[in-house]
Amino acid sequence: AAPCPDACCPHGSSGLRCTRDGALDSLHHLPGAENLTELYIENQQHLQHLELRDLRGLGELRNLTIVKSGLRFVAPDAFHFTPRLSRLNLSFNALESLSWKTVQGLSLQELVLSGNPLHCSCALRWLQRWEEEGLGGVPEQKLQCHGQGPLAHMPNASCGVPTLKVQVPNASVDVGDDVLLRCQVEGRGLEQAGWILTELEQSATVMKSGGLPSLGLTLANVTSDLNRKNVTCWAENDVGRAEVSVQVNVSFPASVQLHTAVEMHHWCIPFSVDGQPAPSLRWLFNGSVLNETSFIFTEFLEPAANETVRHGCLRLNQPTHVNNGNYTLLAANPFGQASASIMAAFMDNPFEFNPEDPIPVSFSPVDTNSTSGDPVEKKDETPFGVSVAVG
């Protein structure tokens, strides 16, 4: 094949090599960019900056090599459009630093930075940690800081991410209240901070106030939906990012719902209870306290992480006619109480007939299959009941 006269020449099926001295000063308009998986750049003294726009359209890029060039600065978001990048070689350039944000979100198997005049500072604490933890092939490079010795020996006692303290009201919060949260940020070299409120949706009206080092957040006219929702304060400095999440407990009275008994490996009377704080529960059977046992007991389903409502069953493992009757669930918390009742019929009473009456003879085909002598339990018939929601 004839030698390629261009600044950048194809290499394999999806690679590009740019090695002609001084031919590039940016990576705009590379030929076939959208399909490139490998880009090799060498001897480009004029290529000094790598920014977000440079790698736009290189979504398939896996391997990027820029070596023996003039690279001085890589923007923190430079690789935003190359999420598949797994090998990054920036050796023998003019890099003094590289932000932790640059590699955040990438799954780099290899990061090569040897031969750069790195300047030891807290901004390289993340790289020092990679070296300590054996990540990305960094330890083998024995990275040096220009005129300061090995990166591994850089003092790091003062290199911490921001410290966050979120103040939440310690008094009870009721539906309709306004709540003020304050996030206090401490640390060196603070760059950015803010709130993450993605979980809040319609739980409150949100107003942000203030800035570093003290961020305010007012949640106005809160609803009970605010419970179990994370409100997150975040802050960043040159070392990294810190986040602290808090939840605001909004008090509201107990409520309860009961549903018709269903057979689920024995029987279940399904219920839902809600309230903040979580209500205490008590069952009544025909008006009397039902003492729970290993054969009649309350069983909760796994709770959803972001809601207060709890679903469960009153489990009746072997109910017979003696368990037929009226079941009431009482739920109470300091803000109110609620109850719901349901009639449940699990099995007909085999002894329920008048001795004076002729003994009924059933010709129902259901009975012909019953050979064990057990009472016939018609499992296809739904027990009658009513569903009541209170609260």
């Epitope: 290993s294 007991f297 493992n317 072997q318």
Partner: antibody
Framework: QVQLVQSGAEVKKPGSSVKVSCKSS????????MHWVRQAPGQGLEWIGE????????NYNEKFKNRATLTVDISTSTAYMELSSLRSEDTAVYYC??????????WGQGTTVTVSS | DVQLTQSPSSLSASVGDRVTITCSAS?????MHWYQQKPGKAPKRWIY???KLASGVPSRFSGSGSGTDYTLTISSLQPEDFATYFC?????????FGQGTRLEIK
């Protein structure tokens, strides 16, 4: 697989107490009731009580109500049965057994408690 | 308390025999459960909910009954079936067991 592993044999003096442990593995400890059953030499099975780790609910056989104490440690998935004021007739093998929707599905290997002066 | 009375207390039988053990409750129980125990071992759940065989229990075993009277039947006795069998009620506190039926080789 489900395992209930009980503590080793004990020899106790009359009037003293014994605490038998039952360590669970292979299932979600809090979802199952734990029963305690004893069997005197050459005799039948006698139910002592049951406990639900999920909420600490305990039911005792009236016969043991004042002497038996059932507890659980959820952090270690372990159930305990303590029997106080021991007498010679408490000499028996003590078993733990778990149940959820069906009775006593799995049993521990048993712990022999001998009460002798 | 619900008293459970098993009969017979002990039974000598030969391999291949059909054997029936009964359990009578002092008051009605919804279901009966049966356990097998061999010397020096913990009991094993054998039949539950009156007629369901526990995992690994051979089909020669069966259970039946209702109200106060329940039976465990072995259709054709095998050498490994010689053991003690206990019935148990799980319908009221305290849970109670029958006194046991010892099945031995004739």
């Amino acid at each position: 697989q489900v395992q209930l592993v009980q503590s080793g044999a004990e020899v106790k003096k009359p009037g003293s107490s014994v605490k038998v442990s039952c360590k669970s593995s292979g299932y979600t400890f809090t979802n199952y009731w734990m029963h305690w059953v004893r069997q005197a030499p050459g005799q039948g099975l006698e139910w002592i009580g049951e406990i639900y780790p999920n909420n600490g609910r305990v039911n005792y056989n009236e016969k043991f109500k004042n002497r038996a104490t059932l507890t659980v440690d959820i952090s270690t998935s372990t159930a305990y049965m303590e029997l106080s004021s021991l007498r010679s007739e408490d000499t028996a093998v003590y078993y733990c057994a778990r149940s959820r929707y069906d009775p006593m599905e799995d049993w521990g290997q048993g712990t022999t408690v001998t009460v002798s002066s | 308390d619900v008293q459970l009375t098993q009969s017979p207390s002990s039974l000598s039988a030969s391999v291949g025999d059909r054997v029936t053990i009964t359990c009578s409750a002092s008051s009605s129980v919804g279901y009966m459960h049966w356990y097998q125990q061999k010397p020096g071992k913990a009991p094993k759940r054998w039949i539950y909910d009156t007629s369901k065989l526990a995992s690994g229990v051979p089909s020669r075993f069966s259970g039946s009954g209702s109200g106060t009277d329940y039976t465990l039947t072995i259709s054709s006795l095998q050498p490994e079936d010689f053991a003690t069998y206990f019935c148990q009620q799980w319908s009221s506190i305290p849970l109670t067991f029958g006194q046991g039926t010892r099945l031995e080789i004739k």
